[in-house]
């Protein structure tokens, strides 16, 4: 049903839903400071153009009493609870940032009449792409996909002369949130992966992963894993690895491989890791500092989320436009907007943009390198290093299947 | 241009206080986390303390933490820097300083502008 916003007569409202199932375990004291700090920014800017209008944020809590496993397994009801309450008290802003489960975000999208537009830090899977008034701040799998498959068809580059068509994936059902969809992603046979891969297979049990580190009659030399160094250690350990194995693990928010004295462990040898650029956001600062990385980055994203809303408000008061509009609430896509750390990019679909990276281990000075890097809006690869000192053969990558020759 | 200036400084007792303020001309004045720094005669000028954009962030150097605090109104284009219980190490001249993005920072190269600096003198 329609409910009516606070949002009109130079007074503008934020729901900020926050949920006991979450995409990270952040204590919801870390998000308020975040959106706190946001809002103050966004006042500043929106005084500074000479727009003299209020803003504030009304943090819409769940009461928890069904619905606690506190991870997004019992998320796609709290989100419609949560709604409801919002229905009840009439509290709708004119925006909704929230939802961050991909469960709660696709039953949110799909159960309410959306005519105000909703901003995630998370809902990573599939079924939340081509939203027309969804905007996700964290990338989501489609990203992801679109980057291996890309890097998988590269055969162009001195470090990468093979063109790959096969892989493994190790998904055992343990992930975080965000590793579970993108792995689910890659793992759906109809999904932009599956479909320019010739051979796929998923790896469920420990042993299987182990088992194909030095199977003769492997089908891929190419693993993809999701999670950070300790839970690929915890899988591998020190067991042997066949010399044409390369495992690519993706740890998107995770920016430690860049700090300074950080030393790759031996295991890390066979490994190439897929992580974000960390552009500005700066490992020592006060923000980050109480933060596990993910976690850094789900803040960050709720604050971005803030940063976006007072970008959007400020064009289209600038041009004498209504805010509680379907074109106020398609807007939230196409566009660059300044975020807490720059510039920040969403797509056609409202879906961030970003630089990704692919790292390698030095057996030289044992550090993390970028290989290349990766921009998702052009869906376009950059190589960096064009003589890493790999652990393969001749410094290149080798071939996806063992035993065949030049592609 | 952006510019810095700093103001309160002077001569004070041991255990005395002091409030240091830092006026700006960047505008909007939300989007800088601002910095304090201060220098020594024969040191390299050192972090003292930082605030984010919206004033929610803030960091300080051990050696003052507990006795300085930060804080910021953005709408007087402001960073202000109340130092209590002050020793004679902390004689030095202070320096405020816009960060190039709104987090909270305290490494120099983080930094883009800075003011001329006001002299603080702890006398025991």
């Known amino acids: 049903s329609q409910v009516s916003q606070n949002c009109h007569n130079g007074s503008y409202e934020i729901s900020v839903l926050m949920m006991g199932n979450s995409a990270f375990a952040e204590p919801l004291k870390n998000l308020e400071d975040a959106v706190n700090e946001g809002l103050e920014i966004v006042r500043g800017r929106l005084q500074n153009a000479g727009l003299n209008v209020t803003v504030n944020a009304t943090f819409m809590y769940s009461d928890g009493l069904i619905h606690n496993s506190g991870d997004c397994r019992s998320s796609t009801c709290e989100g419609l609870d949560l709604l409801r309450k919002i229905s009840n008290a009439q509290r709708m802003g004119c925006v909704l940032i929230g939802p961050s489960c991909t469960y709660s975000t696709f039953q949110m999208y799909l159960d309410t009449e959306l005519s105000y537009p909703m901003i995630s830090a998370g809902s990573f899977g599939l079924s939340c792409d081509y939203k027309e008034t969804l905007t996700r701040l964290m990338s989501p799998a489609r990203k992801l996909m679109y980057f291996l498959v890309n890097f998988w068809k590269t055969n162009d580059l001195p470090f990468k002369t093979y063109s790959w068509s096969t892989s493994y994936v190790y998904k055992n059902g343990t992930e975080t949130e965000d590793c579970f969809w993108y792995l689910n992603a890659l793992e759906a046979s109809v999904s932009y992966f599956s479909h320019e891969l010739g051979f796929k297979v998923v790896l469920r049990q420990d042993k299987e992963f182990q088992d194909i580190l030095m199977d003769h009659n492997r089908k891929s030399n190419v693993i993809i894993m999701c999670g950070g160094p300790e839970f690929l250690y915890k899988l591998k350990g020190d067991r042997a690895v066949a010399e044409d194995i390369v495992i690519i693990l993706v740890d998107l928010f995770n920016d430690q491989y860049f700090e300074d004295n950080v030393t790759a462990p031996d295991y890390m040898k066979n490994v190439l890791v897929l992580t974000l650029s960390p552009g500005n956001s700066l490992l020592n600062s006060s923000f980050s500092r109480n933060l596990s990385p993910t976690k850094r980055d789900f803040a960050l994203a709720y604050l971005n989320g803030i940063l976006l809303f007072g970008h959007m408000l400020k064009i289209f008061l600038e041009n004498g436009e209504n805010i509680t509009t379907p074109k106020f609430a398609h807007a939230f896509r196409n566009l660059t907007f300044e975020g807490y750390d720059g510039p920040v990019t969403l797509d056609d679909w409202g879906d961030v943009d970003s630089t990704m990276v692919l790292l390698y281990t030095s057996v030289d000075t044992k550090k993390y390198k970028v290989l290349l890097t990766y921009d998702t809006h052009v869906n376009k690869t950059y190589p960096v290093d064009m003589s890493p000192t790999f652990t393969w053969k001749n410094s290149k990558l080798p071939n996806d299947i063992t035993g065949r020759g030049p592609q | 241009q952006v510019q810095l200036v700093e103001s309160g400084g002077g001569l004070v007792q041991a255990g005395g206080s002091l409030r240091l303020s830092c006026t700006g001309s960047?505008?909007?004045?939300?989007?800088?986390?601002m910095g304090w720094f201060r220098q020594a005669p024969g040191k390299e000028r050192e972090f003292v303390a930082a605030?984010?954009?919206?004033?929610?962030?803030?960091d300080f150097a051990d050696a003052v933490k507990g006795r300085f605090t930060i804080s910021r109104d953005n709408a007087k284009n402001t960073v202000y820097l109340q130092m209590n219980s002050l020793k004679p190490e902390d004689t030095a001249v202070y320096y405020c300083?816009?960060?190039?993005?709104?987090?909270?920072?305290?490494?120099?190269?983080?930094?883009?502008?800075w003011g001329q600096g006001t002299q603080v003198t702890v006398s025991s």
């Open positions: 960047a505008r909007p004045f939300s989007n800088y986390g």
């Open positions: 300083a816009r960060a190039r993005t709104a987090r909270v920072v305290s490494r120099r190269h983080e930094y883009d502008y």
């Open positions: 605030i984010s954009g919206g004033g929610v962030y803030t």
